[in-house]
Interface confidence: medium
């Protein structure tokens, strides 16, 4: 499919001008290559009319120009003094005319309306309001006032001052007679339809002395604004329909076959399933304007979108509307990243988030999409060191690996963490990506105690058991804080006995805290990584208390509270992969400290988007 995009149809009137914008992916090659506008012949081929290399056909001499805007990835063709001969099929493109890097444009130039003398022209957008003013003389002040529409050869009464209203205009028309000082009546038509366009005649009086005024009403279907966005990127539709519909339900719909327009989202709470997790309808301002953000753009999102206002929350005849034609460029600068990440209850996920590498100093954010009402995405963590209170100790945003990617780690997973999350920065708003976290059946791979109590002035040793599948990974311990997780020295204690059917490649790596102080209290993570790419993590909370009896502590798995959704058996046994195993160190006298922390706020359900781009979390 060609990545060039422009308007499919351009309509104008003889004598007028048009401006046609064509979009292309702004690669360095494309920015500098030839741009052209050509007319398609009946037998194929495409005859150049104007190009960026200075060529202008004699047909366009003195009335056309082509301007390239390489920084935007657009070029614009302006054509003036249009005639009906200019109607036809054209292409705007890059390179050689026959190469296929082009977009088909249909230009239709119609004859201007043949208007009677003294005709007032009203040009109004579809769905809006028109006021037709009709002057009259004093002698007709008390006589009947009326408005007719010319249908074929005959005038048809639309409204009059005796109370008649044509059924086609019921509920959306009124006739106002100004105060005695002004010799004027006006007809106001709301929610204009395309069928309202035409010639009108207003009249005061019915005899030969009546006053008449001709009006030509042109109802404009909104020209769609062209929007060119990258696959996997994001688009924002800004919809400003005016204060007169500030209190009317708003909608965004996508045109399907014919005149159907399927609701994508509306302010009445409707949202199309295909946009679950990746759409927000932002609140209206007092003037009735609103915006819709869609992330994770897919090929199938391309098409014509309309925003509008109607009490039903969907497109109806007479709805005021705005239109966009969205083109999704498959030659995307936004790299592929997993759209689904899987983790197990009690385990962890590490999510890779792409950003525009030109903006390495931008603030990075991670937020949780919530579908309630019109959708919102409250922030959970940012790269400035803010972490939402309920996520302290289990969420971290790391600038690594850098160069266009940052990492978010979330551990101590529960079923409530299932949902959609957005990666974004305060820089390029097009780089908003969505990832769905799914919680699947399974056990966490890393085994750590639950909460641990250390004694002031003593030594604490905390174990982390790594199964053999992580034999080639770097293993680490770190202390969590709101800006990241600071690495700590750890000791490899040899093979772990915590895994069934696991050979000598399993590992027990311990964190040792010597001469414990109050400052040692907090969250500690053990984890695996390969270079700057992070894998699974497990978290332990270390509490610090006053000395009761001398000695050092060697904490074992039995001191753990159960990870969420996991059972701890009596007599110091922990059930791992449905097989109870016994560790010789499980019988230390220390009791576990209860963990009552808030794992996450709110309850969320997972929605399976059926994506094939999946990344494993704690288990496959």
């Amino acid at each position: 499919k060609s990545p060039i995009f422009g308007p499919e149809e351009v309509n104008s009137v003889e004598g007028n001008s048009v401006s046609i914008t064509c979009y292309y992916p702004p690669t360095s090659v494309n920015r500098h290559t030839r741009k052209y506008w050509c007319r398609q012949g009946a037998r194929g081929g495409c005859i150049t009319l104007i190009s960026s290399e200075g060529y202008v056909s004699s047909k366009y001499a003195g009335r056309a120009n082509l301007t390239n805007f390489p920084e935007n990835g657009t070029f614009v063709v302006n054509i003036a003094q249009l005639s009906q001969d200019d109607s036809g099929r054209y292409k705007c493109g890059l390179g050689i005319n026959s190469r296929g890097l082009s977009f088909d444009v249909s230009l239709e130039v119609s004859q201007g309306p043949g208007l009677l003398n003294d005709t007032k022209v009203y040009t109004v957008d579809l769905g809006r309001t028109v006021t037709i003013n009709c002057p009259f003389k004093t002698e007709n002040a008390q006589k009947r006032k009326s408005l007719y529409k010319q249908i074929g050869l005959y005038p048809v009464l639309v409204i009059d001052s005796s109370g008649y209203v044509n059924p086609n205009y019921t509920g959306r028309i009124r006739l106002d007679i100004q105060g005695t000082g002004q010799l004027l009546f006006s007809v106001v038509i709301n929610q204009l339809r395309l069928s309202d366009a035409g010639q009108y005649l207003c009249q005061a009086g019915d005899d030969s002395n009546s006053n008449k005024k001709n009006a030509d009403l042109q109802v404009l279907k909104p020209e769609p604004e062209l929007v060119y966005e990258d696959l996997r990127g994001s688009v924002t539709f800004h919809c400003a329909l005016g204060p007169e519909v500030a209190n009317v339900a708003k909608f965004l719909c996508r045109q399907s076959s014919g005149e159907n327009c399927d609701v994508v989202v509306n302010t009445l709470g409707k949202r199309a399933p295909a946009f679950e997790g990746r759409i927000l309808l932002n609140p209206q301002d007092k003037d009735g304007s609103f915006s819709v953000v869609i992330t994770g753009l897919r090929k199938e999102d391309a098409g014509r979108y309309l925003c509008g206002a109607h009490s039903d929350g969907q497109l109806q005849e007479g709805s005021p509307i705005q239109a966009w034609q969205l083109f999704v460029n498959e030659e995307s600068t936004i790299p592929r990243s997993p759209t689904v990440v899987k983790g197990v209850a009690g385990g962890s996920v590490a999510v890779l988030c792409p950003y525009n590498r030109k903006e390495s100093k931008s603030i990075k954010y991670w937020c949780l999409w919530e579908g309630a009402q019109n959708g919102r995405c409250p922030l959970l963590v940012d790269s400035e060191g803010w972490v939402k209170a309920q996520y302290e100790g289990r969420l971290s945003l790391l600038e690594e690996p850098g160069n266009g990617t940052f990492t978010v780690i979330l551990n101590q997973l529960t079923s409530r963490d299932a949902g959609f999350y957005w990666c974004l920065t305060n820089g390029d708003t097009l780089w908003r990506t969505t990832v769905e976290i799914k919680i699947i059946e399974g056990e966490p791979n890393l085994k750590v105690p639950g909460n641990v109590t250390a004694v002031l002035g003593e030594t604490l040793k905390v174990p982390c058991h790594f199964p053999c599948k992580f034999s080639s990974y770097e293993k680490y311990w770190c202390k969590w804080n709101n800006t990241g997780c600071q690495a700590l020295p750890s000791q490899d204690e040899g093979p772990s006995k915590a895994f069934v059917n696991c050979d000598e490649n399993s590992r027990l790596v311990s964190l040792t805290l010597n001469l414990v102080t109050r400052a040692d209290e907090g969250w500690y993570w053990c984890g695996v990584k390969q270079g700057h790419f992070y894998g699974e993590t497990a978290a332990v909370y270390v509490a610090v208390e006053e000395r009761k009896a001398a000695g050092s502590r060697d904490v074992s798995l039995a001191k753990a509270d159960a990870a969420p959704d996991e059972k701890v058996l009596d007599s110091g046994f922990r059930e791992i992969e449905n097989k109870a195993i016994q560790d010789p160190r499980l019988f230390a006298e220390e009791k576990a400290v209860a963990d009552t922390r808030d794992q996450a706020d709110g309850s969320r359900a997972s929605v399976d988007s059926g994506s094939s781009e999946e990344q494993g979390g704690s288990s496959r």
Partner: nanobody
Framework: EVQLVESGGGLVQAGGSLRLSCAAS????????MGWFRQAPGKEREFVAD????????YYADSVKGRFTISRDNAKNTVYLQMNSLKPEDTAVYYC???????????????????????WGQGTLVTVSS
């Protein structure tokens, strides 16, 4: 749990200035975004300004832009609202509020509806006479 206490309200001439303070108790103050709201007699409560946890991101209602300034001092657990060029229509009870969410982010990033504030003060009355 965060408790909020506003002070600094009072009677002032049109064109004058006032500085409202909101003292918060609770060790997690620094991780909360703070906002000021106001409610004029017989009207709904309306948003005035909010500030992110570190004070780097600010957001103002159009009606107060350029006249009011929100700031915070995390060491003192206090958020301020400096009100200059006061007008009679600024007369209202001013409330301080705190949220564990980050509304300055939400609004600036187009991330959805104004967020729910978890904690509210009792309010302080500001009267601007003409």
């Amino acid at each position: 749990e965060v408790q909020l206490v506003e002070s600094g309200g009072g009677l002032v001439q049109a064109g004058g200035s006032l500085r409202l303070s909101c003292a918060a108790s609770g060790r997690t103050f620094r991780s909360y975004a703070m906002g000021w709201f106001r409610q004029a007699p017989g009207k709904e409560r309306e948003f005035v300004a909010d500030i992110s946890w570190r004070g780097g991101r600010l957001y103002y209602a159009d009606s107060v832009k350029g006249r009011f300034t929100i700031s915070r001092d995390n060491a003192k657990n206090t958020v301020y609202l400096q009100m200059n060029s006061l007008k009679p229509e600024d007369t209202a009870v001013y409330y301080c509020a705190a949220t564990g969410d980050q509304p300055a982010f939400t609004t600036a990033q187009g991330m959805g509806a104004m967020l729910e504030y978890d904690y509210w003060g009792q309010g302080t009355l500001v009267t601007v006479s003409s």
